[in-house]
Amino acid sequence: SIPWNLERIIPAWHQTEEDRSPDGSSQVEVYLLDTSIQGAHREIEGRVTITDFNSVPEEDGTRFHRQASKCDSHGTHLAGVVSGRDAGVAKGTSLHSLRVLNCQGKGTVSGTLIGLEFIRKSQLIQPSGPLVVLLPLAGGYSRILNAACRHLARTGVVLVAAAGNFRDDACLYSPASAPEVITVGATNAQDQPVTLGTLGTNFGRCVDLFAPGKDIIGASSDCSTCFMSQSGTSQAAAHVAGIVARMLSREPTLTLAELRQRLIHFSTKDVINMAWFPEDQQVLTPNLVATLPPSTHETGGQLLCRTVWSAHSGPTRTATATARCAPEEELLSCSSFSRSGRRRGDWIEAIGGQQVCKALNAFGGEGVYAVARCCLVPRANCSIHNTPAARAGLETHVHCHQKDHVLTGCSFHWEVEDLSVRRQPALRSRRQPGQCVGHQAASVYASCCHAPGLECKIKEHGISGPSEQVTVACEAGWTLTGCNVLPGASLTLGAYSVDNLCVARVHDTARADRTSGEATVAAAICCRSRPSAKASWVQ
Amino acid sequence: QDEDGDYEELMLALPSQEDGLADEAAHVATATFRRCSKEAWRLPGTYIVVLMEETQRLQIEQTAHRLQTRAARRGYVIKVLHIFYDLFPGFLVKMSSDLLGLALKLPHVEYIEEDSFVFAQ
């Protein structure tokens, strides 16, 4: 008799754990910026504080009739999904509601900003336990709304936002496009993307993960014990806000970066049918459905990494793409991807004290993506070693020469634009372990890290016959930190990481051109963290 | 994630109005004006004036007051609806779009964003 969505996101071992703390005495507080809500509903009564905050535009139309239960519908349902007694994800959590959406579900960027400022002021006046802010709303891309989310996130608040219901790229909407926000798309009971009329869930690189968002049973504002089902990315975001609240009630010191990494790591992978998304968005959209992670005590000090895609560079000759990790994360490797295969590679550089991953378009190219591998490495000390391009016919070698530093990623950047001149760069694990090798006209960048117990190794997989892609996975217990494509076809599209899988993509036309001796190789750098061990390179 | 995607950014570095104030005449607008790419979602007439990160509390108020004063000299009444201190320095203002060029030339202004709708999802 448990609703499908709760069964999906809360594994069996957590169901019983929850029963031991009925009304929870958690200090986590969730702030909901939405419509007004019905505080007397049995699902949320006693858990919800309806603040006096109200910043909404007038309803449209002269004949609009304000009916309380309709005005409260969206917010009441979401409050119930987060902390409802019977259908809530985090049943013990206290919730504060701020009214930023009117009876028609419309608000303004300015009203939302004032709401976020109200939360910041409350935090300053009366510091409390961990705060989660749920933003089940979306408007067009707004630089200031994203900036406000960034500022609030940097004070330790965790923001969770709806990806949007426009069947579009979430990066075109705010707050969904703010990197500091956990952005949630919606899936149904079959783990497929939610369709809503002619539209549906948003997608793309700005979505962090998906969660149940179709036919979700929750509190109905029609009466104090009524329930109804609602659908949308708001419901999906409410599930993740509930999961985050539960994670923080167990471990109040978890940071935003840790929460996001754990949500990604423990989500259900590869169940979404990516064909629902536009072809150009499929590689950028995470195939992840949220589940409640176990506590860090149960899972030990795993090395956690995620892939961050840049925006598309655009097609101009010198266009660059930049991918950034969160401030707490380490950029362990940088790769690039171009649908046309015309790219001049990738490199890591420091901008304003932060390492960023950059990729460069080539003449005649349609644009590139930079792909950063962002990891949580406690007490890490990472640096970049680079060697300029060697003379024609010579190889360039870069390795980690500092003591106890291990290679976590390689990047290659070609000075020449003539794609026919250059050969693909390579990692060489055979002769000298832990070394990046570049071929003609390639500058080589090695990402080298020292951290207690960090050990890494290279794993390669090659295919000689025709193939659109070559993959290699890190085995259980190891985490993919670097991913490159090694010499093979004269034209590769690039390489990127999908969870623990390194994907090297080959241009369609290049498949026919290849001689049998030219294998395309996907090379993965796999690392693990064993706190008791010394940093080492595994051959 | 935060690249300015489908977004309108207009440079309004308009010539200074004949106002006789040295600091205004000397200040060429480097600030930009931004608005939602979806026209139906725009709220013209309400603007969020975002100031540089390090702007002090008193300077925020002075900038808002300066805008009101200069607008009044041109025969416009503007209303400061809210001043942002805690998350970012700035203020929310109701005014004619005719005054955007003037507002962009104020000291401390980083950019101005036209207000727009957000929707329940």
Epitope: S1, D19, A40, R42, D86, K91, C223, S224, T225, F227 | -
Partner: antibody
Framework: QLQLQESGPGLVKPSETLSLTCTVS??????????WAWIRQPPGKGLEWIGS???????YYNPSLKSRVTISVDTSKNQFSLKLSSVTAADTAVYYC??????????????????WGQGTLVTVSS | EIVLTQSPATLSLSPGERATLSCRAS??????LAWYQQKPGQAPRLLIY???NRATGIPARFSGSGSGTDFTLTISSLEPEDFAVYYC????????FGGGTKVEIK
């Protein structure tokens, strides 16, 4: 079929705490589909809902009585209990326990009080 | 708090007659209203829920109607066992009961 039976002292002194237990038979109190409620009826008067509880011990009280009421559940004994503190003569009533569908699972039946126990009279007097 | 007012307080009728009981709410309760029957020394029994749905085992002579603030319980032809007190109850906002209507034999 499901039956509910109230038990507890019939006489309580003013300012003391009234304690009653409802024993459920013919069904499990541990079902997530139901709430378990207390309702009272002063002699010759109407009915008043006191509060409800679910199998997890999550409670929902009448705002006018909230400060004095505690409802608890013991799933191992298939019982739930009522404590009403600082009683006065105005608390003299027949106290009923009843089942109520939570509403989360519509198939569980109507979201109202059904069935009820037969009631127990509690008199507050010194 | 939503106040439910029942009328009349007492209804004196003979077996076979039609009984019409009224319940008025101080504000809209939509269709979230139920009717209960209580006989002396017994617990109340659910008759009608959500304004017009008969509970399991309730004879067809009992029917409910109304929505918003005005509701009616109708007993088309009174049987001897129908003489009792009838209460309405709402769940739009918390739970409150009406004061009751006593249906007695004339």
């Amino acid at each position: 079929q499901l039956q509910l039976q109230e038990s507890g002292p019939g006489l309580v002194k003013p300012s003391e705490t009234l304690s009653l237990t409802c024993t459920v038979s013919g069904g499990s109190i541990g079902s997530s589909s139901y709430y378990w409620a207390w309702i009272r009826q002063p002699p010759g008067k109407g009915l008043e809902w006191i509060g409800s509880i679910n199998y997890r011990g999550s409670t929902y009280y009448n705002p006018s009585l909230k400060s004095r009421v505690t409802i608890s559940v013991d799933t191992s004994k298939n019982q739930f209990s009522l404590k009403l503190s600082s009683v006065t003569a105005a608390d003299t009533a027949v106290y009923y326990c009843a089942r109520e569908n939570s509403g989360v699972v519509p198939a569980a039946g109507p979201n109202w009080f059904d069935p009820w126990g037969q009631g127990t009279l509690v008199t507050v007097s010194s | 708090e939503i106040v439910l007012t029942q009328s009349p307080a007492t209804l004196s009728l003979s077996p076979g007659e039609r009984a019409t009981l009224s319940c008025r709410a101080s504000q809209s309760v939509s269709s979230y209203l139920a009717w209960y029957q209580q006989k002396p020394g017994q617990a109340p029994r659910l008759l009608i829920y959500d304004a017009s749905n008969r509970a399991t085992g309730i004879p067809a002579r009992f029917s409910g109607s109304g929505s918003g603030t005005d509701f009616t319980l109708t007993i088309s032809s009174l049987e001897p066992e129908d003489f009792a007190v009838y209460y309405c109850q709402q769940r739009r906002n918390w739970f409150t009961f009406g004061g009751g209507t006593k249906v007695e034999i004339k």
